[in-house]
């Protein structure tokens, strides 16, 4: 006997876009208030009723007069084949499912979408299908003519299909890949004919779970949530993504306007705990992430403001700043960094409620500093605020060091011309802008005789003309606050410099290594003096102060050049501040071969000899230490007499070479000559690194024996 609650009024509708069959039916003879757990067995056949492709048991609770619904998604586009659907029902007795009493089957409902297709000779399905990468997709063509041979191509590559009926073939695509945002192209065409159809299969990259989801507040009014959405799906035009924030304690939800961030209004009823779910969603998929936090643990303070400096003195300054009110009056930890010349020189941590204050000490006078401050929640650190930076300059002080002073003394017409030099004080020594230098000249024989001279900055020298007595000179640097300690130097008419022997030193690329004998008795220090540009009239005088226990130093300068002779003088400074010359040194940072030959004067020409002299040749101005001279003599005879040796020149000519080993000997008699003979001579200096150029020889012919001198 048939079950009284059989399914009735089965209607089947289709959704081609989603490839869905939608079933709707009812159960009659069920009282209005009656509820019954039932199971419906649904069978779906394709092409013919005997070809069952799907069986499913659908369990639900049925009420009287209720319309029931069930949907089925087909892998094959519905346009590709006829589908048949029928169902039967049973009371769902979970205890004995094998003893179910099924109703009769409903009659088959036929769904044939092909009936509604147009009159085109060829159709390809599905249209505008949207799938994720890695999916399997079934496509098909429907041909209106069985005579046509039809080929289908995936991105130009022919696909192998299976025939469903004479007019329909289907193609299974496995693990489809994302190719491009405009989708994957599929074309089907009649092999011999003009008919062609194309469809686009939109393959999306898989929607990623949002990463690095985080929320914070800056003002306790708004929570700012951010995340990394990951790679986009590649189909943003066809498959827009949406992001939704849901907070479970309040039950509120907001649709985010942006792809990577969203703002949430903090509840005025001072909700502290927040449990957020961020959902990324597109047509194909949903992805959710969660965070639970206490609002007070997610405070990212705003940058401090109103940074000021008060009570700025020579070495101290008081820094003050304000922090933005957070309503709950919790404590902030503020970090202060003090910069001098671009480097961090001090770091401080300060606890702050509303206003911050810090005394910065140990500062240098007249120095520009930069201080920056940032703050974070002291109790539950989350993030530092941005830095707020402000500059200030400490107050000037009197210069702290005496200027480094030296002198050059010359005797001119019975007077002593003293050029005083001083080095500008460093910024740390000057403690402010140096405005002028005061020079006090005290006659040591008449202590009341004082001269005062003021030299405006930035001058670094002055000239004094004094008579040949002893003077004590005081030099001070002055800024707007005061005067530096004095530098004291004694000059006297007789420097007594000339008796000191000069010693040669060899320079290197690092400079000149100088040493001297320690001086007995009271000495306050040493000074090494030299000229950076000895060939210039002003010479660019340099000096270096050294302590009383120092007996060596290395003098280096960027001005040192190869082939230039540098003269160093080492002075001792007595306790009376009198400098006296101890040693003289001379040398080259690098010796070069002599660059020119002496201008030679020939005299005393006889039939057997002549005299060569080069008295005005300065060995000091040469690019290396001259060790002597070579005299070259060319003759037709080519005979070399004792005292000379045969030499082959660069032009392969042969001559006689005489060697003079004394650089001071600037005269030479060439003898053993033949009367009425033609000779050529050349004089070149030589040094440790080579000799002068082999330039033009000078021609000379000896007279006959009877010619007058």
């Amino acid at each position: 006997e048939p079950l009284p609650w059989a399914p009735e009024s089965l209607k089947v509708s289709i959704n081609s876009t989603h490839q869905c069959l939608h079933l709707q039916w009812s159960v009659h003879n069920l009282a209005y208030h009656q509820e019954l757990k039932m199971v419906f067995q649904i069978e779906i056949s394709r092409i013919k009723t005997s070809n069952v492709i799907w069986v499913e048991n659908y369990s639900t609770t049925v009420k009287g007069n209720q319309l029931l619904h069930w949907s089925w998604e087909s892998q094959l586009p519905l346009e590709c084949a006829k589908h048949f659907i029928r169902m039967r029902s049973a009371v769902d007795d979970a205890t004995t499912p094998e003893q179910r009493f099924w109703s009769n089957w409903s009659s088959w409902e036929e769904v044939d979408v092909q009936n509604s297709l147009g009159h085109e000779p060829l159709f390809v399905f599905p249209k505008d299908k949207l799938v994720e990468e890695g999916s399997n997709v079934t496509i098909c063509y429907v041909s209106r003519s069985q005579q046509n041979n039809i080929s289908c191509y995936l991105e130009g590559v022919r696909m192998q299909g299976q025939q469903l009926d004479p007019n329909v073939s289907m193609f299974n695509l496995h693990n489809v890949a994302f190719i491009r945002e405009t989708g994957t192209n599929i074309y089907c065409k009649v092999d011999r004919g003009d008919d062609i159809k194309g469809i686009v299969l939109f393959v999306s990259k898989i929607l990623e779970e949002p990463k690095d989801f985080s929320c914070e507040t800056r003002d306790f009014q708004t929570l700012s949530c951010t995340w990394d959405p990951g790679r986009d799906t590649g189909l943003l035009k066809q498959l827009p993504q949406s992001y939704t924030l849901f907070e479970s304690f309040s039950g509120k939800k907001t649709l985010c306007k942006h792809k990577g961030w969203c703002n949430w209004q903090v509840a005025p009823e001072s909700q502290e705990m927040y449990n957020f779910t961020l959902t990324a969603e597109n047509y194909l998929r949903k992805r959710s992430v969660h965070i639970l936090f206490n609002l007070t643990h997610r405070v990212h303070p705003m940058a401090p403001f109103n940074v000021l400096f008060k009570d700025v003195s020579v070495t101290n300054a008081t820094m003050t700043w304000k922090v933005h009110s957070t309503g709950n009056y919790y404590t902030l930890l503020c970090q202060v960094e003090l910069y001098g010349e671009g480097k961090v020189i001090q770091k401080h941590n300060v606890s702050v409620k509303v206003n911050g204050e810090l005394v910065l000490s140990g500062l240098e006078p007249d120095t520009e500093y930069s201080a920056q401050v940032r703050c974070a929640n002291a109790n539950h650190f989350w993030k530092w605020s941005e830095w707020t930076r402000q500059n200030f300059t400490t107050v000037e002080a009197a210069p702290s060091e005496a200027p480094d002073v030296w002198r050059n003394v010359k005797s001119v017409q019975g007077y002593c011309v003293v050029t005083l030099f001083w080095k500008p004080l460093s910024r740390l020594q000057a403690n402010g802008e140096i405005l002028f230098y005061n020079i006090v000249v005290e006659d040591l024989d008449r202590p009341s005789g004082l001269q005062l001279l003021s030299v405006p900055a930035p001058a670094n020298r002055t000239e004094l003309t004094l008579d040949q007595r002893a003077y004590q000179i005081h030099v001070t640097a002055n800024n707007s606050v005061g005067t530096s300690p004095a530098s004291v130097l004694v000059v006297s008419g007789d420097p007594g410099d000339e008796e000191v022997e000069e010693e040669r030193v060899k320079g290197t690329e690092d400079g000149f290594s100088l040493s001297w004998k320690p001086q007995p008795g009271n000495i306050t220090g040493y000074i090494v003096e030299w000229c950076d540009r000895p060939r210039d009239p002003l010479c660019d005088l340099q000096w270096k102060h050294l302590g009383p226990n120092t007996t060596s130093t290395v003098i280096s300068s960027d001005a040192f050049r190869p082939g230039v002779r540098y003269n160093f003088r080492i002075y001792g400074i007595s306790t009376e501040m009198v400098p006296y010359l101890l040693e003289k040194k001379t040398g080259y940072s690098q010796e070069l071969a002599p660059s020119d030959n002496p201008r030679v004067v020939m005299s005393n020409l006889t039939s057997h000899s002549f005299t060569l002299s080069w008295k005005d040749y300065s060995t000091e101005s040469q690019p290396s230490f001259i060790r002597g001279y070579h005299v070259y003599l060319k003759s037709k005879a080519g005979q070399c007499h004792p005292g000379s040796e045969k030499a082959v020149l660069s032009d392969d000519s042969v001559c006689c070479k005489y060697k003079i080993d004394d650089p001071k000997q600037k005269m030479f008699v060439v003898g053993n000559l033949q009367p009425e003979s033609f000779y050529e001579f050349l004089v070149t200096p030589y040094s440790a690194v080579g000799e002068g150029p082999h330039g033009a020889f000078t021609k000379v012919t000896t007279p006959d024996e009877y010619s007058p001198m």
Partner: antibody
Framework: EVQLVESGGDLVKPGGSLRLSCVAS????????MAWVRQAPGKGLQWVAN????????YYLDSLKSRFTISRDNAKNTLYLQMNSLRAEDTAMYYC??????????WGQGTLVTVSS | EIVMTQSPASLSLSQEEKVTITCKAS??????VAWYQQKPGQAPKLLIY???TRHTGVPSRFSGSGSGTDFSFTISSLEPEDVAVYYC?????????FGQGTKVEIK
């Protein structure tokens, strides 16, 4: 015979509007993507917009999105292009085209739009 | 947007000579390239799609090749009826874009 016939082209002042129509025949209109492509006098081709089979998805040249609207009426086998706030640079021959996919296998003869004061 | 740069802008060859037009994409477009022919006073006509597939009814002297960024279109033996402007088009990304065209004439 497969045919696309455009109409609606005219001389219009800058700031004005026009609606272009394209009637399709000889094929199942609803079975194809459709598009508009334009060609300024003496110049090359420029894609304007595309529409899918049922009109649920539209695609535009970004610079035209706010002023142009593509639509279709499958019952009438007709494609439309509504053009607002027209500018001198919109002067062109407007072709109605059928898409194989995003490539265009059938073209109408075009309708001329002239924007000038 | 993807720029399609066609070269040469024009060429003049003798009948039965081989014509080669190149099209360079500013980004990788895979094989999503079509070629069109536009004769004077007419609408364009599709010749090649997917870079190398000849459209139905297109003579075999027309061919296309390439993938990624470099594409070429060839007429193996130029006929008088081939005098036209030829355009490439990419359909890999929105907006769809065309090359500036190559004018082919017969000497």
């Amino acid at each position: 015979e497969v045919q696309l016939v455009e109409s609606g082209g005219d001389l219009v002042k800058p700031g004005g509007s026009l609606r272009l129509s394209c009637v399709a025949s000889g094929f199942t209109f609803s079975d194809y993507y459709m598009a508009w492509v334009r060609q300024a006098p003496g110049k090359g081709l420029q894609w304007v917009a595309n529409i899918n089979y049922d009109g649920s998805s539209t695609y535009y040249l970004d610079s035209l999105k706010s002023r142009f609207t593509i639509s279709r009426d499958n019952a009438k086998n007709t494609l439309y292009l509504q053009m607002n706030s027209l500018r001198a640079e919109d002067t062109a021959m407007y072709y109605c085209v059928r898409g194989l996919t995003w490539d265009f296998d059938v073209w109408g003869q075009g309708t001329l739009v002239t924007v000038s004061s | 947007e993807i720029v399609m740069t066609q070269s040469p802008a024009s060429l003049s060859l003798s009948q039965e000579e081989k014509v080669t037009i190149t099209c360079k994409a500013s980004q990788d477009v895979d094989t999503a390239v079509a070629w069109y022919q536009q004769k004077p006073g007419q609408a364009p006509k599709l010749l090649i799609y997917l870079a190398s597939t000849r459209h139905t009814g297109v003579p075999s002297r027309f061919s296309g090749s390439g993938s990624g960024t470099d594409f070429s279109f060839t007429i193996s033996s130029l006929e008088p009826e081939d005098v036209a402007v030829y355009y490439c088009q990419q359909y890999s990304r929105f907006p769809l874009t065309f090359g500036q065209g190559t004018k082919v004439e017969i000497k």
